[in-house]
Amino acid sequence: QAGPLPKPTLWAEPGSVISWGNSVTIWCQGTLEAREYRLDKEESPAPWDRQNPLEPKNKARFSIPSMTEDYAGRYRCYYRSPVGWSQPSDPLELVMTGAYSKPTLSALPSPLVTSGKSVTLLCQSRSPMDTFLLIKERAAHPLLHLRSEHGAQQHQAEFPMSPVTSVHGGTYRCFSSHGFSHYLLSHPSDPLELIVSGSLEDPRPSPTRSVSTAAGPEDQPLMPTGSVPHSGLRRHWE
């Protein structure tokens, strides 16, 4: 008795983070014995799509000509061979950017910071959000998420860095998102260049883990009164 069919490999080209309106191709690669490929999307009727294999039958292509909110989500694929259906692939999370207007990213007290000192990156959104992501250019994953604890929505999130070292220097952007779909992100903020000067060196800095709140000062511009609960944001390190 042969074991279960090996699970296929699932990936997206040009990548799994796609701007609104752009095209994306999802690939499912199984074996040469595959007769049919099936793509399932979480929380959608299964199957989401079926495709015949492309020669030499070991993979199938699922095309999305124009990315919209409906396509964002978590996918798995399967293939059918003469002996039955395979195990599901590992999930692919297809994320759409451009769902909301871009937030603004600031460095306080300044984007010019001396090594050993502290700096806070502040990400502010136009509409209340419950998740904020900080990205450093050329980093493999989001530096961190800030997610509100009770679905409470905030207009901003603080990302403290202390003590700052030369490793913190670089270009940052932030995104904001709603809890009802973390597969939908805002446009990226304009880039923020953090410049670290000084001689204090620490090759493996420890990021600050203090909880940030979105409560701004009294003069916080254009934040509607009463709409920003003063609940904390929970930090998730990636």
Epitope: T104, Q124, P221, L222
Partner: antibody
């Protein structure tokens, strides 16, 4: 590309109402606030208010409160502005504009409303 | 309401020369929360809708030529066109987005001398 296409020119009598539409395309419609801005002939710009298509939230300039109503039809990616009890001072070009972070990064072509008896 | 006052009301500048437009707000537009100035500049050509040039007082919108530059902080702001081109003939508006209601300056008409 982002496009905001407004309805055509209107001529109304004093006391009547006018409803101007703004159809959005080229972006994720529900995630961006849409504002309306008034420009009388040869004059400057005046903010009227906004609507957030995602949930229909509105906010109006006090000067227009009670006479303006903004609505949204998500199925057609269209927002509407209705102005009632029209008077001659309402003669203007009305623009819809997409908000970025309280500033406006895309504008409709404008709709001329003429109020004349 | 925050009152925005532009100067001059009109301006005539020779092609290739520098044009400077000023904008003054009745209260500071600098946020203590993020150290940004909540001010934008728009260009409106005859018969057209306004077009965003500058936001956060000095950030140029994508696609805007680098001859356009914004500066200033607090209550005093400037839009500078370093070398005037024929296509820059327009009315220019500043706008504050620090507090509601959003307000604009009265506009500055820029012409070729």
């Amino acid at each position: 590309q982002v496009q905001l296409v407004q309805s055509g020119a209107e001529v109304k009598k004093p006391g009547a109402s006018v409803k101007v539409s703004c159809k959005a395309s080229g972006y994720s419609f529900t995630g961006f606030y849409i504002d309306w801005v008034k420009q009388p002939p040869g004059k400057g710009l005046e903010w009227i208010g906004y609507i957030f298509p995602s949930n229909g939230e509105t906010s109006y300039n006090q000067k227009f409160k009670g006479r303006v109503t903004m609505t949204v039809d998500k199925s057609t990616s269209t927002v509407y502005m209705e102005l009632s009890s029209l008077r001659s001072e309402d003669t203007a070009v009305y623009y819809c504009a997409r908000q970025a972070f309280y500033y406006f990064d895309s504008w409709g072509q404008g709709t001329t409303v003429t109020v004349s008896s | 309401d925050i009152v925005m006052t532009q100067s001059p009301d009109s301006l005539a500048v020779s092609l290739g020369e520098r044009a400077t437009i000023n904008c003054k707000s009745s209260q500071s537009l600098l946020s203590s929360s993020n150290q940004k100035n909540y001010l934008a500049w728009y260009q409106q050509k005859p018969g057209q809708a306004p077009r965003l040039l500058i936001y956060w007082a000095s950030t140029r919108e994508s696609g805007v030529p680098d001859r356009f530059a914004g500066s200033g902080s607090g209550t005093d702001f400037t839009l500078t066109i370093s070398s005037l081109q024929a296509e820059d003939v327009a009315v220019y508006y500043c706008q504050q987005y620090y507090s509601y209601p959003l307000t604009f300056g009265q506009g500055t008409k820029l012409e070729i001398k």
